[in-house]
Amino acid sequence: SIPWNLERITPPRYRADEYQPPDGGSLVEVYLLDTSIQSDHREIEGRVMVTDFENVPEEDGTRFHRQASKCDSHGTHLAGVVSGRDAGVAKGASMRSLRVLNCQGKGTVSGTLIGLEFIRKSQLVQPVGPLVVLLPLAGGYSRVLNAACQRLARAGVVLVTAAGNFRDDACLYSPASAPEVITVGATNAQDQPVTLGTLGTNFGRCVDLFAPGEDIIGASSDCSTCFVSQSGTSQAAAHVAGIAAMMLSAEPELTLAELRQRLIHFSAKDVINEAWFPEDQRVLTPNLVAALPPSTHENLYFQ
Amino acid sequence: GAMGQEDEDGDYEELVLALRSEEDGLAEAPEHGTTATFHRCAKDPWRLPGTYVVVLKEETHLSQSERTARRLQAQAARRGYLTKILHVFHGLLPGFLVKMSGDLLELALKLPHVDYIEEDSSVFAQ
């Protein structure tokens, strides 16, 4: 049966046994800045092009054992959530991956900046249709990372990022705090904010909306047909990147402001239990869970 | 306003140095382009001292970025410091990535075209 997260973002009219918009997002290219990925996984094979971009720091620890499957874990799962054959949101979207996170999931602001610059240069050299950039990463507040995101957004690129898994104000982290970026928090099957041990999803005025981010089934890098469940605001951001790709494929001329407005408009409202958030953050945190547009856009979204 | 004349060392007479740590992460805009500021991650464990993004003013051309980077290297060498330019940015933001001692920040902040400098820091998969 349909995984809970895909059911949650699907308008009621399309809630059949299967989530199958056959061509969702086909006009859109989604860039993923993450770990390396297993591009021959059945879920994403032929859908993800691995660029030659790589800018990562060395792994920590003298006894670190580098295993390809572990190096690829985070990125492979997210690529699957965005465009996977069976468990993806925008099954028609094509993706390009850039490696900015090492085998331990760690990167640098400078490496991310160079990655964003690479995307901008690629866009200038070979202009294509709408671009979505997924940044499933977070660091401390960074003026320069936010500025680079702003410039890329002004060039017409849609940036989607994870709010962060620190159970903290997203405004203290980047790129989550960049106003031009669509910042996504994570909710679970009960529409509650995701708890990750003592930590959990970030919140506050820098979050634009929430999306499914707990027990998300997606491609596992353990084998080319394996699946695994992962949790986090990265998974939530991947859902919104997929939804954005579907919307932009249906309406390629949408501006960032219009897209953001549509995302908010079609979200489920006031379903999140705000008691989870600190009292002073409740009024600032949007009570929105992302969803695809309803049947009025049937011909556009499910062509 | 008009920029002051460069002396042989490449410093500007009228540039004011404001070395601020911006601990709260919420930077105020620099005053009328006269003050270059320093920023670093408010979370100490995520800081990567020794690598810095030197961000230049918006309309700076690539050739000026390269020249500014070379000037920093020359001035640093005169003071006995080794530096390495790791990347020159253009296309999104003008500037460059440099590996150098934190002792050189004061010098770097006085370079022409510099808007602000940010110490590199870690980002993590979420």
């Epitope: 054992h65 041990g197 930590l199 949790s231 | 464990p45």
Partner: antibody, heavy 122, light 110 residues
Framework: QVQLVESGGGVVQPGRSLRLSCAAS????????MHWVRQAPGKGLEWVAL????????YYADSVKGRFTISRDNSKNTLYLQMNSLRAEDTAVYYC???????????????WGHGTTVTVSS | QSVLTQPPSVSAAPGQKVTISCSGS????????VSWYQQLPGTAPKLLIY???KRPSGIPDRFSGSKSGTSATLGITGLQTGDEADYYC???????????FGTGTRVTVL
């Protein structure tokens, strides 16, 4: 609810081996780093070892390096500590503890077991 | 020998405030996140503070943490008899590539 239960402690002679286990329940075990911490009678806490959530990185205190091995079986939700060449000074209550997150091992430990006692004596 | 130094004991009357210091170096407290733990007599330790000053849910705001340079401080206000316990600071040490605990401080409520 979130729970860690240690087992495998007991009395052992110096030079012998012992394997401690820690059964985790109530949370996604594979998403968290795990620590072993010990406390000698009447003394303070001493960190012993850490393993990352996916087992890719292991760290040890100098006092146990080369003698103790930390491992995990994510399919069984179990953490292990293989203790070889035991010494009298290894006598302690051994706690397993969950790291606050998978990646941010320096955040410390947020869930602790009740401990299992290891006595090394001839 | 612990690399983090705490006072052996502190005491105060009920309702008063106590502070516990934890002194380290740049390789631990100076550049890594500090946590504080409470160990009530005969029980396992419990997390009180992480990331210098954040409290897990369920920990009252009477407990607070701060950091300055290579030292960290735990504050307990409105002291209660139930706060009688041993308190430990802890952090990663980059030089040792390991976690380190403080020497521990016994809090007594007079």
């Amino acid at each position: 609810q979130v729970q860690l239960v240690e087992s495998g402690g007991g009395v052992v002679q110096p030079g012998r081996s012992l394997r401690l286990s820690c059964a985790a329940s109530g949370f996604t075990f594979s998403s968290f780093g795990m620590h072993w911490v010990r406390q000698a009678p009447g003394k303070g806490l001493e960190w012993v070892a850490l393993i990352w959530n996916d087992g890719s990185n292991k760290y040890y205190a100098d006092s146990v390096k080369g003698r103790f091995t930390i491992s995990r079986d994510n399919s069984k939700n179990t953490l292990y500590l293989q203790m070889n060449s035991l010494r009298a000074e290894d006598t302690a209550v051994y706690y397993c503890a969950r790291a606050i997150a998978a990646l941010y091992y320096y955040y410390g430990m947020d869930v602790w077991g009740h401990g299992t006692t290891v006595t090394v004596s001839s | 020998q612990s690399v983090l130094t705490q006072p052996p004991s502190v005491s105060a009357a009920p309702g008063q405030k106590v502070t516990i210091s934890c002194s380290g170096s740049s390789s631990n407290i100076g550049n890594n996140f500090v946590s504080w733990y409470q160990q009530l007599p005969g029980t396992a330790p419990k997390l009180l503070i992480y990331d210098y000053n954040k409290r897990p849910s369920g920990i009252p705001d009477r407990f607070s943490g701060s950091k300055s340079g290579t030292s960290a401080t735990l504050g307990i206000t409105g002291l209660q008899t139930g706060d009688e316990a041993d308190y430990y600071c802890g952090t990663w040490d980059s030089s040792l590539s390991g976690y380190v605990f403080g020497t521990g401080t016994r809090v007594t409520v007079l």
